[in-house]
């Protein structure tokens, strides 16, 4: 039985050319995160394996950075940019856990920033 | 410690099959990993002949035309390699080796490939 | 089909720094890996995803890539470093995936 919870930073806005991080936390579940892939839409952005480390997908090498933690940092922000991302946790015994992120990069510089989200 | 044998036989006719077979030691071959195939011809350099994933995607080096087979033996644990049409530009130092990834469910995020065999001599010759 | 390509020699003394080049069109958006291959050996990975050092290889290996060139340093190369080094990386479709001619290492002891 699936008991864990994943709490994301939820709807998020930035500036175009500025920076965001990408944050997800699983909760409630003493399952073993045997890795965690960050996609946009379909696309893979990165993977942390939990024996092999982080793994930028080779496409965004320049402007995708580790961490904070299991979170995902984006650079260079572009409009296109603007999306749906998903942090999908691969545990064990539980199976696969994921959360939704809702980035709007904005042309303006007024870019209201979501409340920085903290990992407990 | 993960260690990787070839084995095969060291002379094979022109227009014949090379069976090549990497046997897999200290590592399971249904774990998620890359089994790939390398050849060096004498004095010359590596060459990627192609890989299999646990699921059974194979990808091969189109230069080979269509020539080459790698499939799974996950009973025996080992992995192996179908050369057909031989000629003499086939022979080489033939070498199994382990690429690691990192997203261990698709195959993707290609570590690299951390562990070989010593390899094995094939020569073509009548 | 897709290159990468090498000078075919490098020589340094011993304690300089010996760096080898590669080049390819899809680098600027695939990684390059380095094998080193010394005399009736198997290679060995030294470098991987442009800049990775795997656990046991010397701290004076270390990789870089900028645009469509990948460059492999050794600082501080030692007479053991000579060797033959192949770049590797994979097309612009990310597969096949294919090595460098390779480049002579020469460290003159």
């Known amino acids: 039985m699936m008991t864990g919870t994943i709490e994301t930073t939820g709807n998020i806005s930035a500036e175009k050319g500025g920076s965001i991080i990408l944050q997800c936390h699983l909760s409630s579940t003493t399952a073993q995160v045997t890795q965690v892939n960050w996609e946009q839409q379909d696309q893979l952005l990165a993977i942390c394996n939990a024996d092999l480390g982080w793994h930028i997908s080779p496409s965004f090498k320049d402007r995708v950075a580790p961490g904070p933690g299991l979170g995902l940092t984006l650079q260079s922000l572009t409009v296109n940019d603007t999306g749906e991302y998903f942090c999908i946790y691969h545990t064990y015994p539980d199976g696969t856990y994921t959360g939704r992120i809702f980035l709007e990069v904005l042309e303006s510089s007024v870019a209201e920033h979501g409340a920085r989200f903290q990992i407990p | 410690q993960v260690q990787l044998q070839e084995s095969g036989p060291g002379l094979v006719r022109p227009s014949g099959t090379l069976s090549l077979t990497c046997a897999v030691s200290?590592?399971?071959?249904?774990?998620?990993?890359?089994w790939s195939w390398v050849r060096q011809p004498p004095g010359k350099g590596l060459e990627w002949i192609g890989e299999?994933?646990?699921?059974?995607?194979?990808n091969y080096n189109p230069s080979l035309k269509s020539r080459g087979t790698i499939s799974v033996d996950k009973s025996k644990n080992q992995f192996s390699l179908k050369l057909t049409s031989i000629t003499a530009a086939d022979t080489a130092v033939y070498y199994c080796?382990?690429?690691?990834?990192?997203?261990?469910?698709?195959?993707?995020?290609?570590?690299?490939?951390?562990?070989w065999g010593q390899g094995t001599t094939v020569t073509v010759s009548s | 089909s897709y290159e990468l390509t090498q000078p075919p020699s490098v020589s340094v003394s011993p304690g300089q720094t010996a760096r080898i080049t590669c080049s390819g069109d899809?680098?600027?958006?695939?990684?390059a890996y380095w094998y080193q291959q010394k005399s009736g050996q198997a290679p060995v990975l030294v470098i991987h995803?442009?800049?990775k050092r795997p656990s046991g290889i010397p701290e004076r290996f270390s990789g870089s890539s900028s645009g469509t060139m990948a460059t492999l340093t050794i600082s501080g190369a030692q007479v053991e470093d000579e060797a033959d080094y192949y770049c590797?990386?994979?097309?612009?479709?990310?597969?096949?995936?294919?090595f460098g001619g390779g480049t002579k290492l020469t460290v003159l002891g």
């Open positions: 590797f990386s994979t097309d612009s479709s990310g597969n096949p995936r294919v």
């Open positions: 299999i994933y646990h699921s059974g995607n194979t």
């Open positions: 080796a382990r690429a690691r990834v990192y997203d261990i469910l698709t195959g993707r995020g290609y570590y690299g490939m951390d562990v």
């Open positions: 899809a680098l600027p958006k695939k990684y």
């Open positions: 995803e442009d800049r």
């Open positions: 200290g590592d399971s071959i249904s774990s998620s990993n890359w």
